[in-house]
C-alpha cells in the first residue's frame, strides 16, 4: 500500500555566510491531512525552524504556496545564513489530531554546512624589544571560519618560514573555527625594515589569501656602536672631541658627557641621520679649552639607548702635549653638532 513519503532530495547543502539556504522537501501525498514542520536536529532537543500551521519565522520563506490544498512542496529558504545555522534539518509531516497533531513521518534530513570566511589575520610580536641574534616569537590569529580546513604560512620579507606551530580549534565538530600560530624569527641588524607576514588560505577566499603583517621595527632594538675621536681646531688652545653614535634603532637615545667621571652635559638625540637599513647615526661633540686644564682629562661619552643600561666610550685628553690630530672622522652622516667649551 502506498504511504506518504517525505523526500529531502539533498543530503547536504553548502551555503556561504550571509547568503540564503534552500532546503528542499516534497511530501508525496496529501493524505493524511496535517501540517509540515521543519526542525534542526532530531530528538527531544530539536529546534523548530518553521511551522506551516502557526508561528512567526522571519528568516524563513516557503518556496511554494504551502497553504494551498494541493501543495506537496514544502521547501523553505532561510535567509542571512551564519555559521550558527549549521546542522541537520528535518522536514516532518504531522497528522491532524485532537487536541494535538501527531508526528507522522520525517524526511531523511539535509545537512546544512556554512562556509564562513576567516577574519583578517592579526599578527602580534613580543611585548619587549629584542636585539639582533635573538629569537623572537610572533603569533597569528584568525577566527570564525568554516569549514575547518585552512592553510597558514609565515613569511619574512617574502621568504617562507619553517619554524612555526599551528593549532586549529576546536578539535571536534563546531559551527566555526579559529586558528592560532606561533612563528620563531631570528633577528638580524638589518631587520628594521623587515616585515613578518602571516598568510591564511581558505576555500571561501577563492584563491585570494588574507594577510596579516608585523613590522620588525616594532620588535627590534639595534644597540649603537660608539667612537670617540679628538680633532684640533684653528685656535691652538682648543680641541674638538666627537662622540659618534652609529647604527642604532629606535631613535630614543640619551647621551651624557663625563669629565673625569663627573657629568658635564646630557642631551637627547634629535637631528639624526637615517641609514639605508633603517638604523640611525648621531654625533655629539665637545669643544675643550686645554689651557684651562693642568692635568690630563678623561672624557667619557655615555649613551643610554631605549631605556637600556648605559654603554660608554672614553677618551684621554693629554693637556701637556701640543694638540695635534689624534683621530678624524669626516663621514657624511656627522651632521648633528653640539658644542661645549671646558674652561
Amino acid at each position: 500500500e502506498e504511504e506518504l513519503q517525505v523526500i529531502q532530495p539533498d543530503k547536504s547543502v553548502l551555503v556561504a555566510a550571509g547568503e540564503t539556504a534552500t532546503l528542499r522537501c516534497t511530501a508525496t501525498s496529501l493524505i493524511p491531512v496535517g501540517p509540515i514542520q521543519w526542525f534542526r536536529g532530531a530528538g527531544p532537543g530539536r529546534e523548530l525552524i518553521y511551522n506551516q500551521k502557526e508561528g512567526h519565522f522571519p528568516r524563513v520563506t516557503t518556496v511554494s504556496e504551502s497553504t494551498k490544498r494541493k501543495n506537496m512542496d514544502f521547501s523553505i529558504r532561510i535567509g542571512n545564513i551564519t555559521p550558527a545555522d549549521a546542522g541537520t534539518y528535518y522536514c516532518v509531516k504531522f497528522r491532524k489530531g485532537s487536541p494535538d497533531d501527531v508526528e507522522f513521518k520525517s524526511g531523511a534530513g539535509t545537512e546544512l554546512s556554512v562556509r564562513a570566511k576567516p577574519s583578517a589575520p592579526v599578527v602580534s610580536g613580543p611585548a619587549a624589544r629584542a636585539t639582533p641574534q635573538h629569537t623572537v616569537s610572533f603569533t597569528c590569529e584568525s577566527h570564525g571560519f568554516s569549514p575547518r580546513d585552512i592553510t597558514l604560512k609565515w613569511f619574512k620579507n617574502g621568504n617562507e618560514l619553517s619554524d612555526f606551530q599551528t593549532n586549529v580549534d576546536p578539535v571536534g565538530e563546531s559551527v566555526s573555527y579559529s586558528i592560532h600560530s606561533t612563528a620563531k624569527v631570528v633577528l638580524t641588524r638589518e631587520d628594521v625594515h623587515s616585515q613578518v607576514i602571516c598568510e591564511v588560505a581558505h576555500v571561501t577566499l577563492q584563491g585570494d589569501p588574507l594577510r596579516g603583517t608585523a613590522n620588525l621595527s616594532e620588535t627590534i632594538r639595534v644597540p649603537p656602536t660608539l667612537e670617540v675621536t679628538q680633532q684640533p681646531v684653528r685656535a691652538e688652545n682648543q680641541v674638538n672631541v666627537t662622540c659618534q653614535v652609529r647604527k642604532f634603532y629606535p631613535q630614543r637615545l640619551q647621551l651624557t658627557w663625563l669629565e673625569n667621571g663627573n657629568v658635564s652635559r646630557t642631551e637627547t638625540a634629535s637631528t639624526v641621520t637615517e641609514n639605508k637599513d633603517g638604523t640611525y647615526n648621531w654625533m655629539s661633540w665637545l669643544l675643550v679649552n686645554v689651557s684651562a686644564h693642568r692635568d690630563d682629562v678623561k672624557l667619557t661619552c655615555q649613551v643610554e639607548h631605549d631605556g637600556q643600561p648605559a654603554v660608554s666610550k672614553s677618551h684621554d685628553l693629554k693637556v701637556s702635549a701640543h694638540p695635534k690630530e689624534q683621530g678624524s672622522n669626516t663621514a657624511a652622516e656627522n651632521t648633528g653638532s653640539n658644542e661645549r667649551n671646558i674652561y
Epitope: E2, T28, I31, V63, S64, E65, K68, K70, M72
Partner: antibody, heavy 121, light 107 residues
Framework: QVQLQESGPGLVKPSQTLSLTCTVS??????????WSWIRQHPGKGLEWIGY???????YYNPSLKSRVTISVDTSKNQFSLKLSSVTAADTAVYYC?????????????WGQGTLVTVSS | DIQLTQSPSSLSASVGDRVTITCQAS??????LNWYQQKPGKAPKLLIY???NLETGVPSRFSGSGSGTDFTFTISSLQPEDIATYYC?????????FGGGTKVEIK
C-alpha cells in the same frame, strides 16, 4: 484566458534527448498558484503523468522516468521545458503541457493541444 | 503508485441514456480525484474536480460522486457531442496517475 503551446522537434533519434518547450500566454508563470506539468499519451493508449515544476524551480518527477527527465522553467520567457534523455521507440507519444491548480479547484485547468514526438532512426 | 481501475473500458449507449462510469482506487485517496473528457485528436478537458465539483462552463448533465476508493462519474442524458474517452485522475499521491479510460460511443 491562459493558453499553452508545446513546441519542439517531431522526430528524435533513439538514444538522443527529446526537448520540448511550453510557452504560456494570457497568464504569468511566476504569479504562483500553479504547478506546470508534462503529461504524455502513447498512441491509442492512456495518459501518463511525467512531472511538474513550480515557478521557483521546485520539481517532482514520476519515478518511472526520473533518471531521464529534467523539467526547467524560464520565467523571463514565460516558458517551461521538458528534456527526456536516452529515448527509445517506447517514448513515442503525444506530449502535453498543462497547468495544475494548487488550490484544488481547477485541477489541470489548462492544457496545450499536444505535440506528437516520434522516436525513430 | 496508486492504481486507478476504470470500468467499463468502453460502452455504447443511446442519446438521452444515463451513462455511469466507475473508478476504483487501489487505496484511500479521500476526494482527491478529477474526471477528464478527451475527444479524438484533442487534449483532455477537466469536467469534475475533487470527485464531485463541476468545473466552470461544464454542462450540468455531468456529475461525480464518491470518496475513499470508489468513485462514480455520470452523464445523466447522453448527447452526441459527449462521444469521447473519459479518464479519472488521482492527485492524492505522487506520482499522479490516470485510470485506463472509458470510451463512450453512441448506438
Amino acid at each position: 484566458q491562459v493558453q499553452l503551446q508545446e513546441s519542439g522537434p517531431g522526430l528524435v533519434k533513439p538514444s538522443q534527448t527529446l526537448s520540448l518547450t511550453c510557452t504560456v500566454s494570457g497568464g504569468s508563470i511566476s504569479s504562483g498558484g500553479y504547478y506546470w506539468s508534462w503529461i504524455r499519451q502513447h498512441p491509442g493508449k492512456g495518459l501518463e503523468w511525467i512531472g511538474y515544476i513550480y515557478y521557483s524551480g521546485s520539481t517532482y518527477y514520476n519515478p518511472s522516468l526520473k533518471s531521464r527527465v529534467t523539467i526547467s522553467v524560464d520565467t523571463s520567457k514565460n516558458q517551461f521545458s521538458l528534456k527526456l534523455s536516452s529515448v527509445t521507440a517506447a517514448d513515442t507519444a503525444v506530449y502535453y503541457c498543462a497547468r495544475e491548480g494548487l488550490d484544488g479547484s481547477y485541477g489541470s485547468s489548462a492544457w496545450g493541444q499536444g505535440t506528437l514526438v516520434t522516436v525513430s532512426s | 503508485d496508486i492504481q486507478l481501475t476504470q470500468s467499463p473500458s468502453s460502452l455504447s449507449a443511446s442519446v438521452g441514456d444515463r451513462v455511469t462510469i466507475t473508478c476504483q482506487a487501489s487505496q484511500d485517496i479521500s476526494n482527491y480525484l478529477n474526471w477528464y473528457q478527451q475527444k479524438p485528436g484533442k487534449a483532455p478537458k477537466l469536467l469534475i474536480y475533487d470527485a464531485s465539483n463541476l468545473e466552470t462552463g461544464v454542462p450540468s448533465r455531468f456529475s461525480g460522486s464518491g470518496s475513499g476508493t470508489d468513485f462514480t462519474f455520470t452523464i445523466s442524458s447522453l448527447q452526441p457531442e459527449d462521444i469521447a474517452t473519459y479518464y479519472c485522475q488521482q492527485f492524492a499521491y505522487l506520482p499522479y496517475t490516470f485510470g485506463g479510460g472509458t470510451k463512450v460511443e453512441i448506438k
